[in-house]
């Protein structure tokens, strides 16, 4: 059992989630990568890269784009036009076989809320960021894309148990919660 810190990101409808999943290029440069959502106890693969991975060869599935950079050990994931129903727990995995997917840490808890007046949120209207939160509260340090200076905290020691086939992952200390307005 591996303990992971889940990071929670809050977006408004219509915004774009952009994450990077880091991997050991010497081990996984030529492996397929996938973006999955936890639905109940079973992960649902939403998109996966081609085999073998090629630099700058994006794969698009609906609103999701995956771009693998094997030279850099990074997978870029973009989910555009976020909807409330996109909320949930997501993770990048090395897709070796449907029954053996190696999880790339950390899982991301995506929370999508309705924009004010029902309009999509925009980072252009809000330029402050929690990124500058004092370093004494390390758990509150956010990414550069942020707007309100507030950081919502999850209940202490909340635990989510998710599983990929053949493994069980306990997500404890779900405290890294960040508001992240990103471009439409």
């Amino acid at each position: 059992t591996t303990e992971l810190t889940e990071e929670k990101y809050e977006y408004k409808e219509g915004q774009t989630l952009e994450v990077k999943c880091d991997y050991a290029l010497e081990k996984y440069a030529n492996s397929r990568k996938a973006w999955q959502k936890m639905e109940g106890k079973m992960p649902k693969i939403l998109a996966k890269t081609e085999r073998p991975s090629e630099n700058s060869h994006p794969v698009q599935v609906g609103r999701i784009t995956l771009e693998d950079y094997p030279d850099h050990g990074l997978l870029q994931v973009r989910m555009t036009n976020l909807q409330v129903e996109d909320s949930g727990l997501y993770q990048c995995v090395i897709y070796q076989h449907p029954k053996e997917s190696h999880v790339l840490f950390n899982p991301i808890c995506l929370v999508v809320t309705k924009g004010s007046s029902g309009t999509p949120g925009s980072s252009e209207n809000s330029t402050q960021n929690v990124y500058r939160t004092p370093s004494t509260t390390a758990k509150a340090l956010g990414p550069r894309y942020t707007s309100p200076r507030t950081v919502t905290q999850a209940p202490p020691e909340s635990t989510v148990v998710v599983s990929t086939p053949g493994s069980e992952i306990n997500l404890t200390n779900v405290t890294d919660i960040i508001r992240v307005p990103v471009f439409n």
Epitope: E7, E18, V19, K20, C21, D22, Y23, A24, L25, S56, E67, Y69, D71, H72, G73, L74, Q76, V77, R78, F105, N106, I108, S123, E124, T127, Y131, S135, A138, L141, G142, P143, R144, Y145, V180, F183
Partner: antibody, heavy 122, light 107 residues
């Protein structure tokens, strides 16, 4: 406050290696990527690659692959960049820079080290 | 790789002048563009991130705009302390690339 402090200037002979250090303070070292950027005298900025201090995973620009290694020691919040098989054209100021949070697609360099001049000369 | 073309490469303006620098990407980079200021012998300093967001502590005379392939950096009223080289940087795709720089001098 956030600070990145780099090691001092180095003079190396062609074919040798150099290892530059970058000590971070004032933030959680493992939460943000460390990037390395170099600048030859009178030239522009050139990104060399990045390292995730949490995982230790690194990636390098093609021009440097096979010659550069980026590592870290989390116990002392220090990142390292080693460049081998040095040639005269590697003479430059080497900077470490804090990038975006490790999980977000952001390469915004908000804090930089003071730079380390590496001179390669026979 | 994405090429970033900055223009002009140098300019000379008077104190109080409005200064505009452009940066053109060889392909669409959305709003993934940052601007840095670099003074001689010093490390670059972040001024603008994500095209138009002013970094904390940076004077409001600096601004940025654009989207896609064409971006603009503006100093609304040039000050003597603004003498420096200004660089754009894209991070839409790897490898990250910088513009060639624009050297700003006072007339």
């Amino acid at each position: 406050q956030v600070q990145l402090v780099q090691s001092g200037a180095e003079v190396k002979k062609p074919g040798a290696s150099v290892k530059v250090s970058c000590k971070a303070s004032g933030y959680t070292f493992t939460s943000y990527d460390i990037n390395w950027v170099r600048q030859a005298t009178g030239q522009g900025l050139e990104w060399m690659g990045r390292m995730n201090p949490k995982s230790g995973n690194a990636g390098y620009v093609q021009n440097f692959r096979g010659r550069v290694t980026m590592t870290r020691d989390t116990s002392i919040s220090t990142a390292y960049m080693e460049l081998s098989s040095l040639r005269s054209e590697d003479t430059a100021v080497y900077y470490c820079a804090r990038g975006g949070r490790t999980s977000i697609w952001s390469f915004v360099f908000d804090y930089w080290g003071q730079g380390t001049l590496v001179t390669v000369s026979s | 790789d994405i090429q970033m073309t900055q223009s002009p490469s140098s300019l000379s303006a008077s104190v109080g002048d409005r200064v505009t620098i452009t940066c053109q990407a060889s392909q669409d980079i959305s709003k993934h563009l940052n601007w840095y200021q670099q003074k001689p012998g010093k490390a670059p300093k972040l001024l603008i991130y994500d095209t138009s967001n002013l970094e904390t502590g940076v004077p409001s005379r600096f601004s940025g705009s654009g989207s896609g392939t064409d971006f603009t950096f503006t100093i609304s009223s040039l000050q003597p302390e603004d003498i420096a080289t200004y660089n754009c940087q894209q991070y839409d795709k790897l490898p990250l690339t910088f513009g060639g720089g624009t050297k700003v001098e006072i007339k």
